[in-house]
Interface confidence: low
């Protein structure tokens, strides 16, 4: 019969014959022959291969380097790589999460619109009229001004986007 020019899925062409690929989690030791099957071996500890393959070396699990602010989110297996994430208070600088940076704080006058996650930075928004923030924070939203009326007080000092209103007693007319 004619030697094949293409092979089925999960096979590869070598020396004019189709050999089975190694399954995920295993590496190629020797190609198949007319008389023998493809020989595969499991990846070692801290190694993986995530596809049907003919690789002679497994890939090393990613190292979640604490020097870059990383830690393990999910340990790797023989078929999957380790997934890194950032330390609390930090977020990844890229989709691959190869290093981390500190979450941004929102300055006084600005509040947190969206708290940062392991993959996205803090989103700040200016405090609108009627709200204030007097701290630099990665968590605090803008707070509403105190309602003097509900406390039977009057506004003695107007609020700003950075300060609360100051309430004081109402002037009582003497009899």
């Amino acid at each position: 019969p004619e030697p094949p020019t293409a092979c089925r899925e999960k096979q590869y062409l070598i020396n004019s014959q189709c050999c089975s690929l190694c399954q995920p989690g295993q590496k190629l030791v020797s190609d198949c022959t007319e008389f023998t099957e493809t020989e595969c071996l499991p990846c070692g500890e801290s190694e993986f291969l995530d596809t049907w393959n003919r690789e002679t070396h497994c890939h090393q699990h990613k190292y979640c380097d604490p020097n870059l602010g990383l830690r393990v989110q999910q340990k790797g297996t023989s078929e999957t790589d380790t997934i890194c994430t950032c330390e609390e208070g930090w977020h990844c600088t890229s989709e691959a999460c190869e290093s981390c940076v500190l979450h941004r704080s929102c300055s006084p006058g600005f509040g947190v619109k969206q708290i940062a996650t392991g993959v996205s930075d803090t989103i700040c928004e200016p405090c609108p009229v009627g709200f204030f923030s007097n701290v630099s924070s990665a968590f605090e939203k803008c707070h509403p001004w105190t309602s003097c009326e509900t406390k039977d007080l009057v506004v003695q000092q107007a609020g700003t986007n950075k300060t609360d209103v100051v309430c004081g007693p109402q002037d009582r007319l003497r009899a």
Epitope: C64, P66, G69, R71, V72, E87
Partner: antibody, heavy 123, light 108 residues
């Protein structure tokens, strides 16, 4: 019981070199990142070098002040780590500690220490 | 490199006294990478507190640690004679790993 024993120290002339050896037992050496930390007489601690494990391709790191004069290596079959220092200067005189570095995916710290070996550089 | 500055450099305390040693970092580090070591006279250092506030195995509960960002501290609730030692903070946040200059604690 964890044991770490450093050897190879002593008196060396300026410009000379030495090889410190560290024999270990009682913990999983092959998984550990191994380090040398030194302490000059009456002074504080200074990290010198680190060698990571096989899983991390035995990557090596050195303190800048010794870069180019120092080499760290390891022999997993013997659970030993070595430090080769060349072009020695008087300021290299110190107790050299061999220490393992614990890594659990969250943080590293020096968990086991040897008793140290004294190196004196003097003519 | 991250420089760690400890204070005080030396101090003497009476038994039963509360002690606080501070460690200031030249740049912000995650609290997971700040550790404390104790070195008794003539001995090797040993880890005392790891990741800012976790007591290492066998360490008495009178020791505690706290802090974040650039400011960290080690506290001994009630000083005992056996606590005479030099204490070092250390950061594992970035290479080169660095230690504070040490705080020598003596007994009055």
């Amino acid at each position: 019981e964890v044991q770490i024993l450093e050897t190879g120290g002593g008196l060396v002339k300026p410009g000379g070199s030495l090889r410190l050896s560290c024999a270990t037992s009682g913990f999983n050496f092959n998984d550990s990142f191994m380090n040398w930390v030194r302490q000059a007489p009456g002074k504080g601690l200074e990290w010198v070098a680190q060698i990571r494990n096989k899983n991390y391709n035995y990557a090596t790191y050195y303190t800048e002040s010794l870069e180019g004069r120092v080499t760290i290596s390891r022999d997993d079959s013997k659970s030993r780590v070595y430090l080769q220092v060349s072009s020695l200067r008087a300021e290299d005189s110190a107790v050299y500690y061999c220490t393992s570095y614990y890594y659990d995916g969250f943080a590293d710290y020096f968990d086991y220490w040897g008793q140290g070996v004294m190196v004196t550089v003097s003519s | 490199e991250i420089v760690l500055t400890q204070s005080p450099t030396t101090m003497a305390a009476s038994p039963g006294e509360k002690i606080t040693i501070t460690c200031s970092a030249s740049s912000s580090i995650s609290s997971n990478y700040l550790h404390w070591y104790q070195q008794k006279p003539g001995s090797s250092p040993k880890v005392l507190i790891y990741r800012t506030s976790n007591l290492a195995s066998g360490v008495p509960v009178r020791f505690s640690g706290s802090g974040s960002g650039t400011s960290y501290s080690l506290t001994i609730g009630t000083m005992e004679a056996e606590d005479v030692a030099t204490y070092y903070c250390q950061q594992g946040s970035s290479i080169p790993y660095t230690f504070g200059g040490g705080t020598k604690l003596e007994i009055k």
